[in-house]
Every structure is written in C-alpha cells, then in structure tokens.
C-alpha cells in the first residue's frame, strides 16, 4: 500500500487583488479514509479556510468534484482576493475517527503573496 503524500506544487503563489487564486493540492493515495481540509497558518492561530463537510465558505470553490469516490484533487479557488488573504495555505488530510477525525498529514504549504498590479 502506497504511503499518502500531500502535494502542493507551488511554494509561492503571486496573486492580484480582485482576481481569483487557485491553490493546488493533490494526494497520491485514497487511504486512509477521511477528509482533506484547507487551513491558513500553523499553530494556535491556524485558520480554517475550507471544509467540504461543514461551514460556509462563500469565496471558496473546489476545482474538482470532491464527492467523486476516486477524487485525488483537492485544489481550491479563492475569489475576489484582498490584501488580507496573504499567508501560507496548507491542505491537510484527516483520518476518519470517532468521535473526531484525526490529523494525518499536511502538505508543505503554499505562500500566497500579492504580485504587482497589471499595468
């Protein structure tokens, strides 16, 4: 059985205010069973950016259909970028557990920074 890897190919993503940013994340295995969530930052302040199962994330959409059984692409799009959106974003795999899911593996992170405005 292949060990799960969380792939976030971009170390740095330069974005433009008002535009949509795509944060890429793919997994190399369907196991263990459990969701992939998106966060910004690490430690006590880690902020939930997207959770397919619960919550309201009006500016976030998924690139692929996460309900498909064999989906391995957990990339997201964040619309209407503002300066407040800068930071390092992590896709994180959780293993299904009871009563709560348990964090299993994190991607290396993608730093989102503001690029120069188009002239």
């Amino acid at each position: 059985e292949e060990e799960l890897q969380m792939i976030q190919p971009e170390k740095l993503l330069l974005v433009t205010v008002g535009k949509t940013a795509t944060l890429h994340c793919t997994v190399t295995s369907l196991l263990p069973v459990g969701p992939v969530l998106w966060f910004r930052g690490v430690g006590p302040g880690r902020e939930l950016i997207y959770n397919q199962k619960e919550g309201h994330f009006p500016r976030v959409t998924t690139v692929s259909d996460l309900t498909k059984r064999n989906n391995m692409d957990f990339s997201i799009r964040i619309s209407s970028i503002t300066p407040a959106d800068v930071g390092t974003y992590y896709c994180v795999k959780f293993r299904k557990g009871s009563p709560e899911n348990v964090e299993f593996k994190s991607g290396p992170g993608t730093e989102m920074a503001l690029g120069a405005k188009p002239s």
């Epitope: 966060f39 930052g41 430690g43 006590p44 302040g45 902020e47 939930l48 994180v92």
Partner: antibody, heavy 116, light 108 residues
Framework: VQLVESGGGLVQPGGSLRLSCTAS????????MSWVRQAPGEGLEWVSA???????YYTDSVKGRFTISRDNSKNTLYLQMNSLRAEDTAIYYC???????????WGLGTLVTVSS | EIVLTQSPGTLSVSPGERVTLTCRAS??????IAWYQQKPGQAPRLLIY???SRATGIPGRFSGSGSGTEFTLTITSLQSEDFAVYYC??????????FGGGTKVEIK
C-alpha cells in the same frame, strides 16, 4: 467582533473553575481562540489556545491542570481550570488569534482569585 | 522559549514628544513581532503586527520597525490618550507565544 468572558470568581487553592467566552461578529469555528492572563500589577501571559482545526495548546505551567475546549454551535470557548494555585490569580482574557499567531481582538476579561 | 525584553520599564514624557520603545528578542524572530497598548482597567489593543504593519483603525503616529532581534515602537507626537502600558509579543514561535514585560509611558 465581540468577546465576552464569564465564570471568574473566588476559589480556594486546589479548587476548580470554568471560564466561558462567548463570541460574535465572526465565523467562530474557523478561527483560533486563546486565553491570556494578567496577574495583578503584572504583564501578559499566554495560557492556552484552540486552533481553527481544534488542536489545543498550553503553556507549561498549566499543562495537566487546565483544559481548553470550544462549542462551535454556541460560539463559545471554555477554560476548565483544576488544581488551582495562588499564582493562577489573574484577569483572564479571551482573545481571537490571527492565522499568524497574534491577537487581534480581546474581551474585557474575567477575574479569577485563588485564595483561602 | 523566546524571551522578550522591553526597555525602558517606565518612560516619563510630555504630550507632543516623540517616544521610542524597544523590544529585544533572545533569538531571531524574522520580524514576527506585535505591539499592544493597554490602558488601566482595559483589555490590550493591537497596534502593530509583523513588526511594521499597523492594525485597523490605529492612527498614523504609531509606527513599528526593526528586524532580527531588535524592534521599536515609535509614537511621533504623544497624545494624552497614548499614556498607557505597551507590550510586545513574538508571533514567530508558538510554543509558547510570549510577551515582553511591558513599558509604562507616563506623564512627565
């Protein structure tokens, strides 16, 4: 953003107390929340935090005695304090933690006094 | 644990003066420093983060600077409402998050 603490009071050494912090004005479940305390006439000391992923963090002096938890359905953060000591006497502030780990909003605090 | 040392402990100044407060870290913290203001009987208020970024609603007379292990908070023209205690906090290493001991800015 509003944070309102409650549950403070006078307790004897070795006793227990549960603090609550009710939040409004933001999507509570998405954000890290923290407790920071201030002993009378002293500076600020970070105590504990619960991240937006539900992970918990403690300063060494309270590990094993304090438990942080949250009820996202009630927009409420808790701090269960057991085996209280005189040195735990302080104003306990609830604070919202930003993604890069500083505190952007604070409650007014609740006073905990540990004395016999 | 990263230790933050603030100096001076107390500063006596007159309104209108320029004030510089210092915060030194026991190791490099990559500019991850925040500054807070606390008035008697009130909760702390965020002023500056990432060493030099002003928080929402903070007047332009407050500015932060520094890198490596030494950071400063400058108040260009002290107003009566600025007399308070000022704390620095490092947000580089979260195990644990630590504050400086504070600097009290009092009326001369």
């Amino acid at each position: 953003v509003q944070l309102v603490e409650s549950g403070g009071g006078l307790v004897q050494p070795g006793g227990s107390l549960r603090l609550s912090c009710t939040a409004s004005g933001f999507t509570f479940r998405n954000y890290g929340m923290s407790w920071v305390r201030q002993a009378p006439g002293e500076g600020l000391e970070w105590v504990s935090a619960s991240s937006g992923s539900g992970s918990t963090y403690y300063t060494d002096s309270v590990k094993g005695r304090f438990t942080i938890s949250r009820d996202n359905s009630k927009n409420t953060l808790y701090l269960q304090m057991n085996s209280l000591r005189a040195e735990d006497t302080a104003i306990y502030y609830c604070a919202k933690v930003t993604w890069n780990n500083f505190f952007d909003y604070w409650g007014l605090g609740t006073l905990v006094t540990v004395s016999s | 644990e990263i230790v933050l040392t603030q100096s001076p402990g107390t500063l006596s100044v007159s309104p209108g003066e320029r004030v510089t407060l210092t915060c030194r870290a026991s190791q490099g913290i990559a500019g991850k420093i925040a500054w807070y203001q606390q008035k008697p009987g009130q909760a702390p208020r965020l002023l500056i983060y990432d060493a030099s970024s002003r928080a929402t609603g903070i007047p332009g007379r407050f500015s932060g600077s520094g890198s490596g292990t030494e950071f400063t908070l400058t108040i260009t023209s002290l107003q009566s409402e600025d007399f308070a205690v000022y704390y620095c906090q490092q947000h580089y290493d979260w195990s644990p998050l630590t504050f400086g001991g504070g600097t009290k800015v009092e009326i001369k």
